[in-house]
């Protein structure tokens, strides 16, 4: 299950991965030295019945339909890290791999 | 980040894990031999700003606020498998570990 990839011109209404460049400078996040911007991507779209479900559990909850369950939503199902150079809270410069920064795949869960 | 655990008596409105027993017999899924029922759990609740976010990415998308992004939703952030005994599509009975069957933790992503 590779998920769908879309862009701003797509007519796809279902759960899809869209391109998004995060710009730390635009946020005013000056404690991040590098990168100043990176391709993060994001997830958006409808989760129709059985579409793009990452887990069997998602379908089972739809079947059981408990009180308060809102149905599956379009969310990252595969993410990857990026290496960043940044000031930590002690004002030390750190080079580290930060997990959960890039959406590689979207699905319904 | 251990997530919140709730039950049907909880007044918690934020993203929380709730108990749910899935009953395969009630679904009429007779190809599943064991278990006949199991504790699956599910996620429900509001995702307030910065609450229970699994990934830094979630906050970044909220900051960037691209067109069509619906904001984070309450979804499984940690899942575990169960071992199941079931008929496969060749009518063989298989014992296998099925991933993504139990919600261990909920969060906003």
């Amino acid at each position: 299950n590779l998920g769908l990839d879309c862009d701003e011109h797509s007519s796809e209404s279902r759960c899809c991965r869209y391109p998004l460049t995060v710009d730390f400078e635009a946020f005013g996040w000056d404690w991040i030295i590098a990168p100043k911007r990176y391709k993060a991507n994001y997830c958006s779209g409808q989760c129709e019945y059985m579409f793009m479900q990452k887990y069997p559990h998602t379908h089972l909850v739809q079947q059981a339909n408990p009180r308060g369950s809102a149905g599956p939503c379009c969310t990252p199902t595969k993410m990857s890290p990026i290496n960043m150079l940044y000031f930590n809270d002690k004002q030390q410069i750190i080079y580290g791999k930060i997990p959960g920064m890039v959406v590689d795949r979207c699905g319904c869960s | 980040n251990l997530g919140l655990d709730c039950d049907e008596h909880s007044s918690e409105s934020r993203c929380c894990r709730y108990p749910l027993t899935v009953d395969f017999e009630a679904f009429g899924w007779d190809w599943i031999i064991a278990p006949k029922r199991y504790k699956a759990n599910y996620c429900s609740g509001q995702c307030e700003y910065m609450f229970m976010q699994k990934y830094p990415h979630t906050h970044l998308v909220q900051q960037a606020n691209p067109r069509g992004s619906a904001g984070p939703c309450c979804t499984p952030t940690k899942m575990s498998p169960i071992n199941m005994l079931y008929f496969n599509d060749k009518q063989q009975i298989i014992y296998g570990k099925i991933p993504g069957m139990v919600v261990d933790r909920c969060g906003c992503s």
Partner: antibody, heavy 125, light 107 residues
Framework: QVQLVQSGPGLVKPSETLSLTCTVS??????????WGWIRQPPGKGLEWIGT???????YYNPSLKSRVTISVDTSKNQFSLKLSSVTAADTAVYYC?????????????????WGQGTTVTVSS | DIQLTQSPSSLSASVGDRVTITCRAS??????LGWYQQKPGKAPKRLIY???SLQSGVPSRFSGSGSGTEFSLTLSSLQPEDFATYFC?????????FGQGTKLEIK
């Protein structure tokens, strides 16, 4: 602690039907995590799984015996039974009943524990 | 059906010895294998499940290992009560099948 006690005749004539019963004590046969099975062991040979049932009536059998085997459950008596039709001398064996259970705390299926005491069945005229 | 081949079929050993019994499956069964001990006139008793997990109440001198097609049961220091017949069971795909047994005798 679940215990299984077997009953039934030790001698069956060829072409007749072998019938054995296994009575469960120390637990309910209707427990949703329990499954009930039969295994046999011909003299001087290894064990052979015959089949397994669930209290709701779902059964699954060894294909080699399927055409002759019926396993059924009587929840009111807390017992389950084996019927093997058209027996021959090759069906002479010690027959065991056993419980399987699904451990829903660890989500593991557990085979054949505990066992009944065994019933020696001889097929002879 | 999956065949399980045990070796040796019989084995003579002394109290205090370390012995290993092997079980080879005709196809990959992951770790879906158990080991049982049977004494004459008695029902089998489960020693090991999931290839290497020790059944509650079974002495720690019993251990299981292996996955895929090759499995073994090791008794680290034989005790008089360990002389019996040992069977392996595969429960990966039905019909569940047993090995033909290994008879462990006193030398």
């Amino acid at each position: 602690q679940v215990q299984l006690v077997q009953s039934g005749p030790g001698l069956v004539k060829p072409s007749e039907t072998l019938s054995l019963t296994c009575t469960v004590s120390g637990g309910s046969i209707s427990n949703s995590n329990y499954y009930w099975g039969w295994i046999r062991q011909p003299p001087g040979k290894g064990l052979e799984w015959i089949g397994t049932t669930y209290y709701s009536g779902t059964t699954y059998y060894n294909p080699s015996l399927k055409s002759r085997v019926t396993i059924s459950v009587d929840t009111s008596k807390n017992q389950f039974s084996l019927k093997l039709s058209s027996v021959t001398a090759a069906d002479t064996a010690v027959y065991y009943c056993a419980r399987d259970y699904y451990d829903s705390s660890g989500y593991y299926y557990n085979w054949f524990d505990p066992w009944g005491q065994g019933t020696t069945v001889t097929v002879s005229s | 059906d999956i065949q399980l081949t045990q070796s040796p079929s019989s084995l003579s050993a002394s109290v205090g010895d370390r012995v290993t019994i092997t079980c080879r499956a005709s196809q990959d069964i992951r770790n879906d294998l158990g080991w049982y001990q049977q004494k004459p006139g008695k029902a089998p008793k489960r020693l090991i499940y999931a290839a290497s997990s020790l059944q509650s109440g079974v002495p720690s001198r019993f251990s299981g290992s292996g996955s895929g097609t090759e499995f073994s049961l090791t008794l680290s220091s034989l005790q008089p009560e360990d002389f019996a017949t040992y069977f392996c069971l595969q429960h990966h795909i039905y019909p569940w099948t047993f090995g033909q047994g290994t008879k462990l005798e006193i030398k």
